[in-house]
Interface confidence: medium
Amino acid sequence: MGVPTALEAGSWRWGSLLFALFLAASLGPVAAFKVATPYSLYVCPEGQNVTLTCRLLGPVDKGHDVTFYKTWYRSSRGEVQTCSERRPIRNLTFQDLHLHHGGHQAANTSHDLAQRHGLESASDHHGNFSITMRNLTLLDSGLYCCLVVEIRHHHSEHRVHGAMELQVQTGKDAPSNCVVYPSSSQDSENITAAALATGACIVGILCLPLILLLVYKQRQAASNRRAQELVRMDSNIQGIENPGFEASPPAQGIPEAKVRHPLSYVAQRQPSESGRHLLSEPSTPLSPPGPGDVFFPSLDPVPDSPNFEVI
């Protein structure tokens, strides 16, 4: 066969790299959904209503035995792991506020229990889920966490959470309406990465045979023209372009990506990206927890506790 030329080796290297990249994209993110928080900070005046929102992103398994447990709770700042401590929201535990359904389905918490506390959590068909807090007081200020657990038949499979800050203000400095601050660009980049990975997964699966064919043809053409390529290698090697690996120009179309801009917030329902409003009709009833029920005050495993499995 002889020693491969620089071009042949190069084209094969590109092919292998493309193959590896698409294989990784195809296999990598299949199981991993994410939670995005469109806004990381909500600043509201006392007495106002606010809707905190999270969004389920990425591939969602719609298997018959797969359901999603979505809930809300409060946590505290300065922890090693954000959202690891689970505190109630207005005396309602995350169990009281939970939604349960398959995939991107709509759901609501029971009205009677939550509404007595001025709360309502809801979920729509597009992966958005939210908690609405009515008549805010200074005591409502703090870190809020949304949690999504994928459950296959009884057992938990995958767990993700999102965090956001609520600041309730009073006095002359308080805004007249809620003001929301978008999540930092890093969060956005992570979300974009998740979306891209999902896209790459689909593209990867579709393009894999095409890439393999191209690589094979490249190799064949390269070996057939080895003599000519050796002669003209110096002049051609700098002209090799691979559209799949062009350096991306700086994103000029996104101004002030690193700056957090407050957005005026109308204190009703948060619309979803599709323009639809979150559902407000009650879905399935949820009884308040009885005295014998288990709670999950923290993520620390409880030794030999038979009533639950800490996830």
């Epitope: 035995d65 359901t67 447990y69 169990q95 939970h98 349960h100 359904h101 398959g102 657990v149 459950i151 296959r152 038949h153 009884h154 057992h155 938990s156 499979e157 399935t284 009833p285 949820l286 009884s287 308040p288 927890p289 009885g290 014998g292 029920d293 288990v294 999950f296 038979p306 009533n307 639950f308 499995e309 996830i311």
Partner: antibody
Framework: QVQLQQSGAELVRPGTSVKISCKAS????????LGWVKQRPGHGLEWIGD????????NYNEKFKGKATLTADTSSSTAYMQLSSLTSEDSAVYFC???????????????WGAGTTVTVSS | DVLMTQTPLSLPVSLGDQASISCRSS???????????LEWYLQKPGQSPKLLIY???NRFSGVPDRFSGSGSGTDFTLKISRVEAEDLGVYYC?????????FGGGTKLEIK
Amino acid sequence: QVQLQQSGAELVRPGTSVKISCKASGYTFTNYWLGWVKQRPGHGLEWIGDIYPGGGYTNYNEKFKGKATLTADTSSSTAYMQLSSLTSEDSAVYFCARGGYYYGSSWYFDVWGAGTTVTVSS
Amino acid sequence: DVLMTQTPLSLPVSLGDQASISCRSSQSIVHSNGNTYLEWYLQKPGQSPKLLIYKVSNRFSGVPDRFSGSGSGTDFTLKISRVEAEDLGVYYCFQGSHVPPTFGGGTKLEIK
């Protein structure tokens, strides 16, 4: 304490249906799975299926699909299992049992009912 | 379906002796979340089953420490260190990792 009270024994004709009940007390009915298990002499225990009353989800053993229908009434904290097109093969003791907590359970059945005997005979 | 095979079918013991019951699954019962949902139940004559052990080796609340579970993958064992009269009955192993959950055929613990 946590209890599951099952309905009494049933003597039914072949080809008919029967609906047996399981009333839960001592815990929040909507927060736990509730399963059904069949026991026939010489056949051991068989999982029929389970229901999550809080969301109305059901899981069935393929073997019992079309035979058993699981429902729950959250207002009375009662689960039901209807068995249709009964034959002598359906003569057995049927247990209801509380499954794990919805949010990632460690086990299947921690509390069992006393069982309901169903006899199919002409 | 995952087939759970228990041995022996019958286990005659003297009170105070150690008893050991084996349970083998037809495939690995490690759940995709990393846990192994293998349980042991005891059914006394005329009663409903009672949970003894969950997740291979965890004793359920109120279960005496003479009961212990062990094993991994496809092979599991229940040991009773000193058999008492109240331990007599049929022992069932059960897997909850795969749908449908399945029980073993049972092992009858009886007095020799």
